[in-house]
């Protein structure tokens, strides 16, 4: 994935959660937060932007409560003392449900948006520079964290059942004579246009000269198999696409496909009957020569959730599960626009996709 | 090209129930909120209600709310506003619109509009 | 609810007269202000966006400013196409998350 300079995101971390941001907070960075907030247990949740782990030194302490009608506790805390409450006496989050909720740092305030909407902003009391953290706590499910600097464009993965919490990225192609073991390294800078998470259809909508549109998704969508939907200006280097889901318990295969008109330029393929993780590409209905290699045992198990990540770039796919890059697929079909139609099938539960 | 085409608008009796419908072209129902807006003959524009299918969430204003429900489908790419116990003071015009809400790629701020509108779809409620 | 008044509801202008209508919010909503242009029988267009940002393919004439919670459309010579009634929208969160002013219908005089 290319996140334009970006710190890559944290996928569904565990709460509570502490998180290191990258370079500190800067005029300019928006980081989103996307959630469920839990039905059951507790009347509160928390995100606090602060220096270091120990909780004394809160910049912005943003802490909904399910108290009184509901409310929204806006605060800062120095050197363990808490200051006024400001306090906005409308609830826009919801019990059971999740919630898009977006921090945006100027020079002046925090600016705040949930759902889509300004919910509030908040007048920096303490330099935002001395920030370094971001932590989340309460009654509060997560299913990312994400980092937007200035004058890049958003991508945000939402895995909310992937089992791992840190930035995930592919190495990095070989530069000079040193490479990288494989495993999870920054990723490439590179321009990122639109995303979009959904549930049957993608295709993001353009409002202004260089768009931003934020990913959607609807809430626990039931995902009809085989999913298809289409992937707007089709491939393109630096164009991500992400999916979790659970293998179901007797699964023997699944697939997913990314295929322009009647071709699959890419049918990677998932086989628990050969505990085989099997790539190919059909052209004219006429398969090429099967690809299997895996730099570790199969990713996938029966019964357990995953997610996969695949970028495009200019010469290959790079295909990583779990947070862990897996494997290279270099392009067979080479006019990427034209690889614009996503398929999924077989034996998985899908919980989101990313286009 | 972005479309909205808003449909099934008509005549109902106070009480009674329409389903207005907005089918979008040119983008997803998903990729931004969506909002209804009416506008009563000879007033102005009131906002009715919106949906965030990020995150599911909806809103709608006080005088409708109980009544109508907003909803999509994205199989469909439509949204749909069930509009039930109809009254006189609901005939209006309504209109669907996305509604965009994203940080600027170009600067550090957020911006928000209304960029699409349908052309509207009349519901008359008269006995 | 906040509340966005919009003066004056009506105003009687001339081609190339410098045009200002004005909406007042009850309480501060940030820079989360669009203005719209409607035309009898049409749908609403979006002119500015974020208070003070001109949407793309409307023409430089128009303008929108915002000072506390006052907000500004200037049209600073008005064209024969601008005579049409004019919204201010609020999108800061409250128990109505969006509202609307009462319009400015811009009259040939």
């Known amino acids: 994935m290319a996140f334009s300079g970006s710190q890559a995101p944290y996928l569904s971390p565990a709460v509570p959660f502490s998180g290191t941001i990258q370079g500190g907070l800067q005029d300019g960075l928006q980081i989103t937060v996307n959630g469920t907030v839990l039905s059951s247990s507790g009347t509160r949740f928390a995100v606090n932007f602060q220096t270091g782990f120990s909780g004394n030194d809160i910049a912005f302490h943003f802490n909904p409560r399910f108290e009184d009608g509901g409310y929204v506790v806006c605060n800062t805390r120095q050197n363990g003392s808490w200051g006024p409450e400001e306090r906005k006496t409308h609830m826009p989050f919801q019990k059971g449900m999740p919630f898009d909720l977006c921090f945006l740092v100027q020079s002046s305030d925090f600016k705040v948006m949930v759902n889509g909407i300004l919910f509030v902003q908040y007048f920096h009391r303490v330099p935002f520079h001395r920030v370094d953290t971001i932590s989340v706590n309460g009654s509060v499910q997560l299913s990312y964290i994400s980092f937007q600097n200035p004058r890049t464009v958003p991508v945000q993965p939402a895995f909310s059942t992937v089992p791992f919490s840190q930035p995930v990225c592919f190495p990095p192609r070989p530069r000079g004579r040193r490479q990288k073991p494989p495993g999870v390294w920054p990723a490439n800078p590179a321009p990122i246009t639109q995303t979009v998470i959904h549930t049957v259809q993608s295709a993001p909508g353009q409002m202004f000269s260089t768009p931003a549109i934020p990913p959607m998704m609807y809430p626990h969508p039931a995902y009809p198999m085989p999913f298809i939907t289409t992937i707007l200006g089709g491939l393109y280097p630096s164009k991500s696409i992400l999916l979790s889901g659970t293998v179901l318990p007797s699964a023997q295969r699944f697939h997913i496909n990314l295929c322009s008109g009647n071709h699959i330029a890419f049918h990677l393929n998932p086989r628990f009957d050969e505990n085989a993780v099997v790539r190919n590409t059909q052209i004219d209905n006429s398969w090429g020569s099967e690809e299997r290699s895996l730099p570790r045992k199969m990713p996938f198990v029966r019964g357990q959730s995953f997610s996969v990540w695949i970028l495009c770039e200019a010469h290959c796919l790079k295909v990583a599960v779990d947070g862990q890059h897996l494997f290279e697929y270099y392009h067979r079909l080479r006019n990427l626009p034209t690889i614009n139609r996503l398929e999924v099938g077989g034996d998985i539960q899908l919980t989101h996709v990313q286009t | 090209e972005v479309q909205l085409v808003e449909s099934g608008g008509g005549l109902v009796q106070p009480g009674g129930s329409l389903r207005l419908s907005c089918a979008a072209s040119?983008?997803?129902?998903?990729?931004?909120?969506i909002h209804w807006v009416r506008q009563a003959p000879g007033k102005g524009l009131e906002w009715v209600a919106y949906i965030y299918p990020y995150s599911g969430y909806t809103s709608y204003a006080d005088s409708v709310k109980g009544r109508f429900t907003i909803s999509a489908d994205t199989s469909k790419n439509t949204a749909y506003l069930q509009m039930n116990s109809l009254r006189a003071e609901d005939t209006a015009v309504y209109y669907c619109a996305r509604y965009s809400t994203y940080s600027s790629s170009s600067s550090s701020k957020w911006v928000w509009g209304m960029d699409y509108w349908g052309q509207g779809t009349l519901v008359t409620v008269s006995s | 609810d906040i509340q966005m008044t919009q003066s004056p509801s009506s105003l009687s202008a001339s081609v190339g007269d410098r045009v200002t209508i004005t909406c007042r919010a009850s309480q501060s909503v940030s820079s989360a202000v669009a203005w719209y242009q409607q035309k009898p029988g049409k749908a609403p267009k979006l002119l500015i966006y974020s208070a003070s940002s001109l949407y793309s393919g409307v023409p430089s004439r128009f303008s929108g400013s915002r000072s506390g919670t006052d907000f500004t459309l200037t049209i600073s010579s008005l064209q024969p196409e601008d005579f049409a009634t004019y919204y201010c929208?609020?999108?800061?969160?409250?128990?109505?998350?969006?509202?609307f002013g009462q319009g400015t219908k811009v009259e040939i005089k």
């Open positions: 929208q609020q999108s800061y969160y409250d128990s109505n998350p969006i509202t």
């Open positions: 040119g983008f997803t129902v998903s990729s931004s909120s």
